[in-house]
C-alpha cells in the first residue's frame, strides 16, 4: 500500500524548489525498479516528483490565499513489466499559511450620524475589518481594533469594532469628526499587519439652545396717523441650534397699554412689531415694551434649556403729525 | 465713568443767542437719547428738549418751539443747545442729562450752565 | 400733558425720622413711568427711583418708591444728615413732566 504523512507547503517561498514530501509504496524494495508519477492539476508545473524516490517538490512560489490546497493523484509503476504497482490514489497538498494580508475594511466609506449630547457609552457604528489570512491558523487573521483619531470623544471596543461616544459633544462647537481605527492582526502582537479607516461621524441637532435676542433694546417709531395693523418695526433673536429646533415664537411679554402686538416671521424668524390701537402723540408720545421669544418646537426632555425665555425691550417713540 | 460737562453759559440781551455744549465721556454717546433740562432760580425742573440716539428725532417743550434747536455731534462726543429769541424766563442753568437706556428717566446729569437774559 | 403736585411742600424732620413724600398725577402715569430725584444745594439732581419702585444705581436701601396710576409715594426711611435736601417727582408716560419739588429741611 502506499504509504505518506499529510504534505504541507508553505506559501510565499522564494526557493526554486521547496521539498513538499515523498510518495512511497511499501512495496519499493529502493533497487529503483518503480517509477513514480504525478497528476491532476498543478502536477508538472506546481510540483514535481523525482521519479525514482517519489520526492515531491513546489517549484513554484504559492499564495494560500489564491489556492490553498491541490488535489493530486499518485501512480507506481513497476518498470521492469510496465505494470501499476498500486492502485492510482488521491492525496492532498495544503498550503500552509503565513501572516502575509494585513486587514482591510470593505465597507469604506463609513459614516454615522448620532444625536448631540448623547451620553457616554451611546453606539454610534461598527466597523469590521476582514483578512485574508486563515483564520484557523494561528492569529494571522485575528484582529484588534484600535482608535488612532477621536479620542476624548469616542472609543473602539477591541474585539468587535463598535464604536461609542466617550464624552459628550456639542453641535454647535463642532459638527462633525474624523475618527480613524485601525485594525491589526496577530492580535496585536510583534510581527502584526494593520489597514486603517476613517470614519465621518456627523452630529445631529437636538434642541438644546433657546432663542436669545441679538440686542436688549430695540428702537422704533410709529406715526400717530398709523392705522391699525401697521408694521412698526422688526425684532430679531438667534438660536445656536438648526432646522425645526431654530423655529421661535416672538411674543408680547409687558405692555400695559396694550397698544401693540408681535407676529412671528416663519420665513425670516423675525418678530414684527405692529400697532393694536392707534396712537396719539399729544396723550402719550413713547411707549416700553418687553417682548419675549421662544422655540416653536421644545421637546419634554430637554425643557431644562428653556426655562428663563431671552426678553427685550422696545422703546416706540410717536411721532407728532400736525393737525389740521 | 460718566461724565457730562456743559459749557457755553453767559449773559446775552434779550432777543440774542446763545449755543450751549455737553461734552460726554465715560460711555457710548451714540447709543443714547440726550436731553436738556433748566432750573430757573429758586425755582424746580423744566424739561426743554429731547433728542434720539441717532440724532433723527428731536422733541421740544413748548415754552421753546421754534426758538430752541437741539443737536448732537457724534464724532465729537458732545450735545448742543441753540437758543435764539432769547427772553427773559429763559434765564436758568441749563443741565444735560442722558436718558437710561432700558426707560426714560435721567441717569446721569452734568453740572450745569448758568444763562442770563437781561438787558 | 401731566401735571405732578407733590406735597408738602417743605418737610421738617430730624435725623432718624421717616420722610414720606407725595406727588399726585393730573391723570394716570401708564406703566409706572415715574421717578424721583434728589438734588442738594448747588448740585445737579441725582436720580434716585425709576419705574416707581426701582432703586438707581448706587441708591442707599432707605430710599423706596410707590405707588401706581395718579399717587405715588417717595418714603425715606431714617434721614441721614446727607438726605436733607430737595426731591423731585418726574413723569415720563408723556414727554417729561416734573413736580414743583418738595424740600426735606432739618427740623
Known amino acids: 500500500g502506499w504509504v505518506w504523512n499529510q504534505f504541507f507547503v508553505p506559501e510565499e517561498m522564494n526557493t526554486t524548489s521547496h521539498h513538499v514530501g515523498r510518495l512511497r509504496s511499501d512495496l519499493d524494495n529502493g533497487n529503483n525498479s518503480f517509477q513514480y508519477k504525478l497528476l491532476g492539476a498543478g502536477a508538472g508545473s506546481t510540483f514535481i516528483i523525482d521519479e525514482r524516490t517519489g520526492d515531491i517538490y513546489a517549484i513554484e512560489k504559492l499564495d494560500r490565499e489564491e489556492r490553498s490546497l491541490y488535489i493530486l493523484r499518485a501512480q507506481v509503476i513497476d518498470i521492469t513489466t510496465g505494470r501499476a504497482v498500486e492502485p492510482e490514489s488521491e492525496f492532498v497538498i495544503k498550503v500552509s499559511d503565513i501572516n502575509d494580508n494585513e486587514p482591510k475594511f470593505l465597507d469604506e466609506p463609513y459614516e454615522a450620524i448620532v444625536p448631540e449630547m448623547s451620553p457616554e457609552g451611546t453606539l454610534v457604528i461598527q466597523v469590521t475589518a476582514s483578512d485574508a489570512d486563515d483564520p484557523s491558523s494561528g492569529n494571522n487573521a485575528r484582529l484588534l481594533y484600535s482608535l488612532l483619531q477621536g479620542q476624548p470623544y469616542f472609543s473602539v471596543e477591541p474585539t468587535t469594532g463598535v464604536i461609542r461616544i466617550s464624552s459628550k459633544m456639542d453641535r454647535e462647537l463642532q459638527d462633525e469628526y474624523w475618527v480613524i481605527i485601525q485594525a491589526k492582526d496577530m492580535i496585536g502582537q510583534p510581527g502584526a499587519l494593520s489597514g486603517t479607516t476613517s470614519v465621518l461621524i456627523k452630529l445631529s441637532d437636538v434642541n438644546d439652545n433657546k432663542p436669545i435676542f441679538k440686542e436688549s433694546l430695540y428702537r422704533l417709531t410709529v406715526s400717530e396717523s398709523a392705522p391699525t395693523g401697521t408694521s412698526i418695526g422688526t425684532i430679531m433673536a438667534y438660536d445656536n441650534d438648526i432646522g425645526e429646533n431654530a423655529e421661535m415664537d416672538y411674543s408680547i411679554e409687558e405692555d400695559d397699554s396694550q397698544t401693540f402686538d408681535i407676529i412671528t416671521n416663519h420665513e425670516t424668524q423675525e418678530g414684527i412689531v405692529i400697532l393694536k390701537k392707534k396712537v396719539n402723540f399729544e396723550h402719550q408720545n413713547h411707549y416700553g415694551i418687553r417682548a419675549k421669544v421662544k422655540n416653536h418646537h421644545v421637546d419634554e426632555q430637554l425643557m431644562k434649556y428653556h426655562t428663563e425665555a431671552s426678553t427685550t425691550f422696545i422703546k416706540i417713540q410717536v411721532e407728532d403729525v400736525d393737525e389740521p | 465713568q460718566v461724565q457730562l460737562v456743559e459749557s457755553g453759559g453767559g449773559v446775552v440781551q434779550p432777543g440774542g443767542s446763545l449755543r450751549l455744549s455737553c461734552a460726554a465721556s465715560?460711555?457710548?454717546?451714540?447709543?443714547?437719547?440726550m436731553h436738556w433740562v433748566r432750573q430757573a432760580p429758586g425755582k424746580g425742573l423744566e424739561w426743554v428738549a429731547v433728542i434720539s440716539y441717532d440724532g433723527t428725532n428731536e422733541y421740544y417743550a413748548d415754552s421753546v418751539k421754534g426758538r430752541f434747536t437741539i443737536s448732537r455731534d457724534t464724532s465729537k462726543n458732545t450735545l448742543y443747545l441753540q437758543m435764539n429769541s432769547l427772553r427773559a424766563e429763559d434765564t436758568a442753568v441749563y443741565y444735560c442729562a442722558r436718558e437710561r437706556y432700558f426707560d426714560w428717566s435721567f441717569d446721569y446729569w452734568g453740572q450745569g450752565t448758568l444763562v442770563s437774559v437781561s438787558s | 400733558e401731566i401735571v405732578l403736585t407733590q406735597s408738602p411742600g417743605t418737610l421738617s424732620l430730624s435725623p432718624g425720622e421717616r420722610a414720606t413724600l407725595s406727588c399726585r398725577a393730573s391723570?394716570?402715569?401708564?406703566?409706572?413711568?415715574l421717578a424721583w430725584y434728589q438734588q442738594r444745594p448747588g448740585q445737579a439732581p441725582r436720580l434716585l427711583i425709576y419705574g416707581a419702585s426701582s432703586r438707581a444705581t448706587g441708591i442707599p436701601d432707605r430710599f423706596s418708591g410707590s405707588g401706581s396710576g395718579t399717587d405715588f409715594t417717595l418714603t425715606i426711611s431714617s434721614l441721614e444728615p446727607e438726605d436733607f435736601a430737595v426731591y423731585y417727582c418726574?413723569?415720563?408716560?408723556?414727554?417729561?413732566?416734573f413736580g414743583q419739588g418738595t424740600k426735606v429741611e432739618i427740623k
Open positions: 465715560g460711555f457710548t454717546f451714540s447709543s443714547y437719547d
Open positions: 391723570q394716570s402715569v401708564s406703566n409706572t413711568y
Open positions: 418726574q413723569q415720563y408716560s408723556n414727554s417729561w413732566t
